[in-house]
Every structure is written in C-alpha cells, then in structure tokens.
C-alpha cells in the first residue's frame, strides 16, 4: 500500500482543515488508514482523524483544530496499521479557504434600489473577520447571458445596486463568496443562492 498523491490540506482558519490524498489502488480509507496530526506547541496533544473515501483510491480527512492562529504548524503522519506511509507538515495560515458567507438576503422594498446583505462567516475575534472581501454573482434565470459579478472590496457585508440595472419583470438569483488578501486565500465556496422577482417603475418620459 502506497501513497500516490501526497496529502494536500486547506484550512477554514477557524476550526476545520481538510486534507485529501490518493492511494495507489482502491482503498477502504476509514478502516485501513489513520491520519495523526499534532500542533507543534508546548503541551499539544496528538489527534487522530479517520479518513473517508473520496473516489476509489482517494481519501479525505477533516481535522478539527482549536484556536487557529498564523504561527500554528502541524505535523501530519499517515498510517496504515503499524506502517508509516507518509510524514509531512501543514501550516493552516498558508493554505486558507474561507468559509462561505451565509444568510444572503435581497431587500427589494428600498425605493428602486436592491439591497443585498449577507453574514460574515467568522466571529469578531477571528483575524479573518475584518479582512474578508466579497464577490456577488447575480444572474437571470431566463437569460444565461445576463450574468454579472460585483466585487465588494469594503468590509461591510452588503451591496446596493439600482434595480434598473437589471431587467424588470423577471426573476434573478444571487450568491456570494469571500476571500482574504492578507493570507492570499483561495475563494470560498459560493453561498446558497437566493431568488427574487425584479420589478421597478420605469420613470415617466417627459
């Protein structure tokens, strides 16, 4: 039994890091393998992650981590019974994929303005809380070509757009994702989308 593709890990910089790897043949990851991980720090304890299958030869493990900060570094040991298959390390702050924003809401009752709001996925004492920027994707259910991205580079988790920039009388969907420049993160997954019917009064022609 050998590792074909070494584990690669990403962290949500809060409580979970996800590691994926591939074996050289079909493997029952949960019964045959264990991923041991330990913070390189005074008094830290070793933890065991039981991997799940991710395709025939692929495995995935969700590592639970407390109080993740930029100085943290973890040792990783992949075991098959008594055999050490792979040894490595992982620094969560260097491989961050933020959590997806939540609670995306479209407020249509503001005069001819659409207000989109969502929730920051991190608590205020997490470093990423004040460093997330967002991309909002709005698209028409009727017209695949009517697809737009708004970059929200300020900290406020909201976006105002004039209803008139979208077509009236049709349904739209929106979703939002996040990233943080400070840690050179990847983009988060998209939030669940929300749907609304866009209608506004055309201005009277003089």
């Amino acid at each position: 039994m050998k590792v074909l593709q070494e584990p690669t890990c990403v962290s949500d910089y809060m409580s979970i890091s996800t590691c994926e790897w591939k074996m050289n043949g079909p493997t029952n990851c949960s019964t045959e393998l264990r991923l041991l991980y330990q913070l390189v720090f005074l008094l830290s304890e070793a933890h065991t992650c039981i991997p799940e299958n991710n395709g025939g030869a692929g495995c995935v493990c969700h590592l639970l981590m407390d109080d993740v900060v930029s100085a943290d570094n973890y040792t990783l040991d992949l075991w098959a019974g008594q055999q050490l298959l792979w040894k490595g390390s992982f620094k969560p702050s260097e491989h961050v994929k933020p959590r997806a924003p939540g609670n995306l809401t479209v407020h249509t009752n503001v005069s001819d303005t659409l207000l989109l709001t969502w929730s920051n996925p991190y608590p205020p004492d997490n470093y990423l809380y004040n460093h997330l920027t967002y991309a909002v994707n709005i698209w028409s259910e009727n017209d695949p070509a009517d697809f737009r991205i708004y970059n929200v580079t300020y900290l406020e988790p909201s976006l105002r757009i004039a209803a008139s920039t979208l077509k009236s009388g049709i349904s739209y969907r929106a979703r939002v994702r996040a990233w943080a420049q400070c840690y050179n993160t990847t983009w988060s997954e998209w939030s669940p989308s929300t749907k609304w019917h866009n209608s506004y009064r055309e201005p009277f022609e003089q």
């Epitope: 720090f41 005074l42 008094l43 830290s44 304890e45 407390d66 109080d67 900060v69 930029s70 100085a71 943290d72 004492d125």
Partner: antibody, heavy 116, light 111 residues
Framework: QVQLVQSGAEVKKPGASVKVSCKAS????????MHWARQAPGQGLEWMGI????????SYAQKFQGRVTMTRDTSTSTVYMELSSLRSEDTAVYYC?????????WGKGTLVTVSS | QSVLTQPPSVSAAPGQKVTISCSGG????????VSWYQQLPGTAPKLLIY???KRPSGIPDRFSGSKSGTSATLAITGLQTGDEADYYC????????????FGTGTKLTVL
C-alpha cells in the same frame, strides 16, 4: 464576549501558599490554552507557566518549578494557580491570559501581598 | 530575567510619531513571532500587535509593528494623550526550553 474573572486580592505571610482562580466565560473553555504571568510593583511582566485545559497538562517556567501548581476545573471553566513557600519577592499582581503564541484576553489581575 | 531589551522611556508631543524598539536574539525574535502589549496605569496588558504586524479587531491603524532579523519595532502615529502607557514586546524563546518572554518595558510619555 470572552471574560476572565480573577479572584480577589490576598495578603499572605512568608512561607504560606496562595491559590488564585481565573473563571472563564464566553468561549469553549477546553479549546484555548491559559497562561499565568505576574508583575511585581513597578516591574515588567514575567511568565510563570501554561495549562492546557483540555487534558490538564502543564508546563512551568524554570524559576517556579516545584513551587507552582496549575490546575483546572472543566465543570466551572476555572483555572487555578497555586504558589507555595511565599516570600516577600512574590508580592505582585498575578494575571491569567488566554492564548498560545500571544495573549489576546487577560484577566484584570489579582494582587498578592506577602508580608510578615 | 528578560532577554528582550527595550528603551526604558520615550516621549513625544501629541500628533507626533514615536517608535519603540525591541532587541532580542536568534533563539527568540529571530525565530518566532513578535507581539506588543499596551498597559495603561493600573490595568491589565492589552494586545496591540501580534504575528509581528497584525492588529486585533478594535486596535486603530495608528499602531503598527514590524520585525527585521532579531529586532522588532512598534510605531505609533498621531500620538494621543490616551496613549501614555507602558509598552511591552513579547515572543517565544527556544533556549534552553520553549517559553514566552517579554521585553523590559517602555514608558511612553505624551508631552
């Protein structure tokens, strides 16, 4: 929000022991390390030791080895620091502080006065 | 005994900029992250800077940190009277054993 509430001021005689408590609230108690540091009057900060509330393991500064004991009670989310064989040089404000490499949350401090 | 050296005192007028240095060695600052703490009179220390140059939520951007080799610097711009306090640097030392250490402390006076 995170709060670390320490016990009140103590006056002790030389040779006695003191036990200072630090009650945590507003977060998952076992998920964060707790340090103890002290500050003598007009002096700087001095690290005493650390406890991992999850398993209760400890590490102490060499200077305090054999005199300090740190414990925790997970049922009340409280950590304790006991210092024995007190001498006048132990007169200081004792702080608990939450964190690993740096300490974002501190207790208000407990003044321990050692005087005959 | 602290192995991080800071100037005992610095002073400047309101609105000015001041810097506080913290000098260590290869077994501490040279090999670890630096944090800075502000201690107002009669209160507990407060985290100002961590990870060499990051500010916790609620700390104004007048405060900044940097690190080069075995020394670190805290800079405060637009000085206010409320900034008058003691400032401590902190890091981890690996010799002879892993442990946190603090600087000797610097008293900032706003003239």
């Amino acid at each position: 929000q995170v709060q670390l509430v320490q016990s009140g001021a103590e006056v002790k005689k030389p040779g006695a022991s003191v036990k200072v408590s630090c009650k945590a609230s507003g977060y998952a108690f076992t998920s964060y390390y707790m340090h103890w540091a002290r500050q003598a009057p007009g002096q700087g900060l001095e690290w005493m030791g650390i406890i991992n509330p999850s398993g209760g393991s400890t590490s102490y500064a060499q200077k305090f080895q054999g005199r300090v004991t740190m414990t925790r009670d997970t049922s009340t989310s409280t950590v304790y620091m006991e210092l024995s064989s007190l001498r006048s040089e132990d007169t200081a404000v004792y702080y608990c502080a939450r964190g690993k490499w740096w300490w974002q949350h501190w207790g208000k401090g407990t003044l321990v006065t050692v005087s005959s | 005994q602290s192995v991080l050296t800071q100037p005992p005192s610095v002073s400047a007028a309101p609105g000015q900029k001041v810097t506080i240095s913290c000098s260590g060695g290869s077994s501490n600052i040279g090999n670890s992250y630096v944090s800075w703490y502000q201690q107002l009179p009669g209160t507990a220390p407060k985290l100002l800077i961590y990870d060499n140059n990051k500010r916790p939520s609620g700390i104004p951007d007048r405060f900044s940190g940097s690190k080069s080799g075995t020394s670190a610097t805290l800079a405060i711009t637009g000085l206010q009277t409320g900034d008058e306090a003691d400032y401590y640097c902190g890091t981890w030392d690996t010799s002879p054993v892993d442990r946190p250490i603090f600087g000797t402390g610097t008293k900032l006076t706003v003239l």
